[in-house]
Interface confidence: medium
């Protein structure tokens, strides 16, 4: 039950995270800029990965796409790539995890197959989340290191006045959405990986059967039998005998006096 809950919660958290990554990638407000100290008009400029927009106090808003690929900064291209890779991996991870969900029965799919699929989707979610966090962080770093600060081109005019005006860029809403979404996808992926451990069939230590050819009789102690899984009390593997290939539950439910060699 706990495994199913962990897997289901991991799926939901990852789903929300990937939806957030998609939203952040599509959002226009990656960096925002106020034309501060500029009496021309109250204008709010903001830029995304795909286009730039201007919103005026009058309510007029206009956006223009970046129609060039080659002319764009390499860092912007890198951020775009990271976000797209994150979305693609996340989408594939969601698709795989749907079939891996314990609550969904598809034919006669074994638990081991579901465990592998859960692990695969978990790893995909982790990588997806890391891609999104990396992309957003690279962009944020560009803002912090003044890469996106505009140094005005002011020509020496009749007055002989030359000035440099810097345009301040701040973090846009998309950065925070991206960070949170990336984190959620990462957490969801970790939860899926944890769920995978619970889904995998436990390896019982049936191979540790000790055969004695000598005449020494070994007495069977009722109640002392347990198939060693690493979780039982018999962790030192001291003389565990099993005459038949039964599950741990079967052995504990129906102890037999013939369980010795």
């Amino acid at each position: 039950m706990a495994v199913t809950a962990c897997q289901g919660l991991g799926f939901v958290v990852s789903l929300i995270g990937i939806a957030g990554i998609i939203a952040a990638t599509c959002m226009d407000q990656w960096s925002t800029q106020d034309l501060y100290n500029n009496p021309v008009t109250a204008v709010f400029n903001y830029q995304g990965l795909w286009r730039s927009c201007v919103r005026e106090s009058s309510g007029f808003t206009e956006c223009r796409g970046y129609f060039t690929l080659l002319g764009l900064p390499a860092m912007l291209q890198a951020v775009r790539a990271l976000m797209i890779v994150g979305i693609v991996l996340g989408a594939i991870g969601l698709l795989v995890s749907i079939f891996a969900l314990k609550c969904i029965r598809i034919g006669s799919m074994e638990d081991s197959a579901k465990a592998n699929m859960t692990l695969t989707s978990g790893i995909m979610f982790i990588v997806s989340g890391l891609c999104a966090i990396a992309g957003v962080s690279v962009f944020a770093n560009m803002l912090v290191t003044n890469f996106w600060m505009s140094t005005a081109n002011m020509y020496t005019g009749m007055g002989g006045m030359v000035q440099t005006v810097q345009t301040r860029y701040t973090f846009g809403a998309a950065l925070f959405v991206g960070w949170v979404a990336g984190g959620l996808t990462l957490i969801g992926g970790v939860m899926m990986c944890i769920a995978c451990r619970g889904l995998a069939p436990e390896e019982t230590n049936y191979k540790a059967v000790s055969y004695h050819a000598s005449g020494h009789s070994v007495a069977y102690k009722p109640g002392g039998f347990k198939a060693s899984t690493g979780f039982g009390s018999n962790t030192k593997n001291k003389k565990i005998y099993d005459g038949g290939a039964r599950t741990e539950d079967e052995v504990q439910s129906y102890p037999s006096k013939h369980d010795y060699v």
């Epitope: 002319g71 600060m149 005005a152 005006v165």
Partner: nanobody, 121 residues
Framework: QVQLVESGGGLVQPGGSLRLSCAAS????????MGWYRQAPGKQREFVAG???????NYAHSVKERFTISRDNAKNTMYLQMNSLKSEDTAGYYC???????????????WGQGTLVTVSS
């Protein structure tokens, strides 16, 4: 690179009118806000009037009711119609624009070389 070229300046009598033009040329992707500034000899450069891409306008108190700013987005040109000119309007008039540069993904604040307006009898 975006260049701004002002024209229309000259000598005019007090009470007269002038129309200044500012044309943007070069690698223009988008020019958002445009404005006029002036600088009288020995004084600081001051804001005169401004217009946004959407047509929102703003004026300095000293020129309100007398000056009118307009813009033709298709031609990337801005105009300043100056009426009822006074001697204190004598100055170099500079064109200013916020131009979006897609190559660097940033705004460039561009200034023109200026045009001289002299109001004298």
């Amino acid at each position: 690179q975006v260049q701004l070229v002002e024209s229309g300046g000259g000598l005019v009598q007090p009470g007269g009118s002038l129309r200044l033009s500012c044309a943007a040329s070069g690698n223009i992707f988008r020019i958002d806000t445009m404005g006029w500034y002036r600088q009288a000899p020995g004084k600081q450069r001051e804001f005169v009037a401004g217009i946004s891409r959407g047509g929102s306008t703003n004026y300095a108190h000293s020129v309100k009711e007398r000056f009118t700013i307009s813009r033709d987005n298709a031609k990337n040109t801005m105009y300043l119609q100056m009426n009822s000119l006074k001697s204190e309007d004598t100055a170099g008039y500079y064109c200013n624009a916020q131009a979006w540069d897609p190559g660097t993904i940033r705004y460039l604040e561009v200034w023109g070389q200026g045009t001289l307006v002299t109001v004298s009898s």
